[in-house]
């Protein structure tokens, strides 16, 4: 739950949270830093590093919730990236590790800052959720399917094949981070 | 509306402590990031680090780090920006703002509050 | 950490006049993926906290009149002021968020000519 009072208007809460949406799709923010970090930086590895379907909820699947179903949908799904981040960050090498083999420390920093980062943005779906529950005009919940379950890594023989499963979760997070904007967009 | 009001200015000799305060209203506290901002008299706004108040995560600038300790206390929507030992160099007018995701642009500004380190 | 250098340090325009101001980082702060600039400019009148004009490079926070637009991509960025008004004296400021440490551009003082 939130802390602190929430925004009682709409307008001003879906443009921050378009605002924050827009912020943290960019590879830029995450995937990019996880590959430099992880030595995936080559263009035949990058080729690897592509979504699996049906990790992440599509465009199309989160245009065809009502809004609470979406906002449960989406709360859900970011509570399984939290998951997977806190693995994904638990086998990054430390600072001092990073700074030996001549690595930029801003972007471990990038990726420990998306934890907190996606907190924030959960907190800003709980007070929508909040102001959409106290509407007179508040649509009937459609639940949205498939974000219950985190999306898995498949079995991972080696540290390789784990770091490419982390890159392949990371550009599934970004899609869906875009698709998530585009879909409060249209509020 | 939102709202971040900052404490008092602050007028205190070389090597004592301080903490100032900075408290978030008219909106979640822990949707957000807090940073904090100086501006030496006359110049320009220089990052010193930025804090998530949901979990007390923090960052600070490489120039800033062991100089000053930044905190947060959810419970009560203050964010805290603090130092053990000032210097006469530390006479600043010191900003909090909001920031929507780390890092970013920062959104809402606290009024400042200006710190006098003089013996 | 990526520096911002603004020009000029400060500009004289007669009211109704355009002013602008330029501001250059040493890397760029475009987006991989989204095409999203990570820099914003801000307005700091005497004795105020500066105040957020516009976001990435281009788009005007709310409630800030339509004369001050942004623009440029990359490295390189501009802030237009297309008619020059007696409150916007101010100094104004860049400030990238493509990475930590944040750092701002040195500031553009405005006066009136």
């Known amino acids: 739950a939130a802390i602190g009072s929430c925004s009682k208007e709409y307008r001003v809460l879906l443009g921050q949270l378009q605002k924050q949406t827009d912020l943290m799709q960019d590879t830029s923010r995450l995937l990019d830093p996880y590959i430099r970090i992880q030595g995936l930086d080559v263009p035949k590895l990058r080729e690897h590093c592509r979504e699996r379907p049906g990790a992440f909820p599509s465009e199309e699947t989160l245009r065809g919730l009502g809004r609470r179903g979406f906002l449960q949908t989406l709360n859900a799904t970011l509570g399984c990236v939290l998951h997977r981040l806190a693995d994904l960050e638990q086998r990054l090498p430390k600072a001092q590790d990073l700074e030996r083999s001549g690595l930029n420390i801003e972007d471990l920093e990038k990726l420990q800052m998306a934890r907190p980062n996606i907190l924030g943005l959960r907190n800003n779906i709980y007070c929508m959720a909040q102001l959409l529950d106290n509407s007179d005009t508040a649509e009937p919940t459609k639940a949205g399917r498939g974000a219950s379950q985190p999306p898995t890594p498949t079995p991972a023989s080696d540290a390789f094949q784990r770091k490419l499963e982390g890159c392949r979760f990371l550009h599934g997070y970004h899609r869906f981070m875009h698709s998530v904007g585009r879909v409060f967009s249209k509020w | 509306e939102v709202q971040l009001v900052q404490s008092g200015a602050e007028v205190k000799k070389p090597g004592e402590s301080l903490k100032i305060s900075c408290k978030g209203s008219g909106y979640s506290f822990t949707s957000y990031w807090i940073s904090w901002v100086r501006q030496m008299p006359g110049k320009g706004l220089e990052w010193m680090g930025i804090?998530?108040?949901?979990?007390?995560?923090?960052r600070y600038s490489p120039s800033f780090q062991g100089q000053v300790t930044i905190s947060a206390d959810k419970s009560i929507s203050t964010a805290y920006l603090q130092w053990s030992s000032l210097k006469a160099s530390d006479t600043a007018m010191y900003y909090c703002?909001?920031?929507?995701?780390?890092?970013?642009?920062?959104?809402?500004w606290g009024q400042g509050t200006l710190v006098t380190v003089s013996s | 950490d990526i520096v911002m250098t603004q020009s000029p340090d400060s500009l004289a325009v007669s009211l109704g006049e355009r002013a602008t101001i330029n501001c250059k980082s040493s890397?760029?702060?475009?987006?991989?993926?989204?095409?999203?600039?990570?820099l914003a400019w801000y307005q700091q009148k005497p004795g105020q906290p500066p105040k957020l004009l516009i976001y990435?490079?281009?788009t005007r926070e709310s409630g800030v009149p339509d004369r001050f637009s942004g623009s440029g991509s990359g490295t390189d960025f501009t802030l237009t002021i297309s008619s020059l008004q007696a409150e916007d004296v101010a100094v104004y400021y860049c400030q990238q968020y493509f990475s930590t440490p944040i750092t701002f551009g040195q500031g553009t003082k405005v006066e009136i000519k």
């Open positions: 703002a909001r920031v929507p995701v780390s890092p970013a642009y920062l959104d809402y």
């Open positions: 990435s490079a281009s």
């Open positions: 804090i998530y108040p949901g979990d007390s995560y923090t």
């Open positions: 890397q760029s702060v475009l987006g991989s993926s989204s095409n999203i600039n990570f």
